[in-house]
Amino acid sequence: VPRWRQQWSGPGTTKRFPETVLARCVKYTEIHPEMRHVDCQSVWDAFKGAFISKHPCNITEEDYQPLMKLGTQTVPCNKILLWSRIKDLAHQFTQVQRDMFTLEDTLLGYLADDLTWCGEFNTSKINYQSCPDWRKDCSNNPVSVFWKTVSRRFAEAACDVVHVMLNGSRSKIFDKNSTFGSVEVHNLQPEKVQTLEAWVIHGGREDSRDLCQDPTIKELESIISKRNIQFSCKNIYRPDKFLQCVKNPEDSSCTSEI
């Protein structure tokens, strides 16, 4: 067994990772009083326990179960917003529409958003040099397994009408290989979810095409329909105006199509 540090293809653990996770947990409990029963030290210990001393290509959902249990949170199941390749706008939306939630508005999503982490087999060290890349190295790495686990649970919790924001500027507006396409779509519960409503966000100022007719959207509709869930789709031609109208719905310019 080589004793030198394994070199992976992806960036290493985010600097100040333990401090950041702990600080984020405390911040979250400060601004979400209903989560003040959470013991942030235990949360960090469970997070650490999921990947420390384990081979970073051999992580399982089971490894994250203690963390999942500590981070259990009830969000209104009919107020869930999924997103794919358009995170910033989705977060701007829930920041204004306070009764809707993305995964990153929950404790576990908030803790891990934009962070990278991994350990090394048989040592208690965190690897700040490199971590496995999903494509080039392995899919069962700490970060990918974490997001797969929390995304599955989030989708499973959804009910009634579930919304998803999709990036209309991408070549594949719906991508089967994204977390939304590979995990969330398949874990929506048909006995609870009536409709998946896609919001296709346009990028270009002059783009007046109906992107709901895009072949990848038709593919999404087909997958969803086969799961006995209704599908609907809306074009959001002007994302800036869309956000403005969510903020000020009584504005006279907000009656026209956005």
Epitope: T20, R36, D39, Q41
Partner: antibody, heavy 123, light 112 residues
Framework: EVQLVQSGAEVKKPGATVKISCKVS????????MHWVQQAPGKGLEWMGW????????DYAEKFQGRVTITADTSTDTAYMELSSLRSEDTAVYYC????????????????WGQGTLVTVSS | DIVMTQTPLSLSVTPGQPASISCQSS???????????LNWYLQKPGQPPQLLIY???TRAAGVPDRFSGSGSGTDFTLKISRVEAEDVGVYYC?????????FGQGTKLEIK
């Protein structure tokens, strides 16, 4: 040592906008929520809102909603509070404030305060 | 919003004597985590408020032990066992159980 240092006093005309800064030192800016509190002369304390400097997310008291904007610049470790459409009732001292963390739990009390910024609204 | 009501609004105390300030909340401030989210502050003239007590009864760092907080879910008391000249100012209670955090109207303490 934790310090919150606010910008100087301002005199504004009704209808104008004021922007107050709060520069922090002695801790990692993004690790804590920053709150803003208003104190009108001879009156009590009124919470205005908070910002999470790391994400830029905010929440405001209903009373100030639509007129207040709290922002943060992580490159300079500075939080800002902007109040628009000023009226005479906005004449007050404005404070930035932060909680202490007691063994990985937010205390729920504002343990650190800026020195305050007096804003006078007068025609 | 939770309403905080303080009594009395002012009091005058002889140095070395005890003082007591009451605060009542319109809802219980006891969280399911067992903590009561009630804070006490002292604001001295020309200064920002300083935290004295958090979680109803825990003294903040550097606060003398003559200050103590007690109470139940909705009725709270700040006691100063022996008032000193430096204790003059306005005392505020505050709830931080939920947003928006709200303050009492303040109690002015002066020395006789």
């Amino acid at each position: 040592e934790v310090q919150l240092v606010q910008s100087g006093a301002e005199v504004k005309k009704p209808g104008a906008t004021v922007k107050i800064s709060c520069k922090v030192s002695g801790y990692t800016f993004t690790d804590y929520i920053m709150h803003w509190v208003q104190q009108a002369p001879g009156k009590g304390l009124e919470w205005m809102g908070w910002i999470d400097p790391e994400y830029g997310s905010t929440d405001y008291a209903e009373k100030f909603q639509g007129r207040v904007t709290i922002t943060a610049d992580t490159s300079t470790d500075t939080a800002y509070m902007e109040l628009s459409s000023l009226r005479s009732e906005d004449t007050a001292v404005y404070y930035c404030a932060r909680v202490a963390i007691i063994t990985t739990v937010a205390s729920g009390g504002f343990a650190y305060w800026g020195q305050g910024t007096l804003v006078t609204v007068s025609s | 919003d939770i309403v905080m009501t303080q009594t009395p609004l002012s009091l005058s105390v002889t140095p070395g004597q005890p003082a007591s300030i009451s605060c009542q909340s319109s809802e219980s401030l006891l969280h399911s985590n067992g903590k009561t989210y009630l804070n006490w502050y002292l604001q001295k003239p020309g200064q920002p408020p300083q935290l004295l007590i958090y979680w109803m009864s825990t003294r903040a760092a550097g606060v003398p032990d003559r200050f103590s907080g007690s109470g139940s879910g909705t009725d709270f008391t700040l006691k100063i066992s022996r008032v000193e000249a430096e204790d003059v100012g306005v005392y505020y209670c505050q709830q931080f159980l939920e947003y928006p955090p709200t303050f009492g109207q303040g109690t002015k303490l002066e020395i006789k």
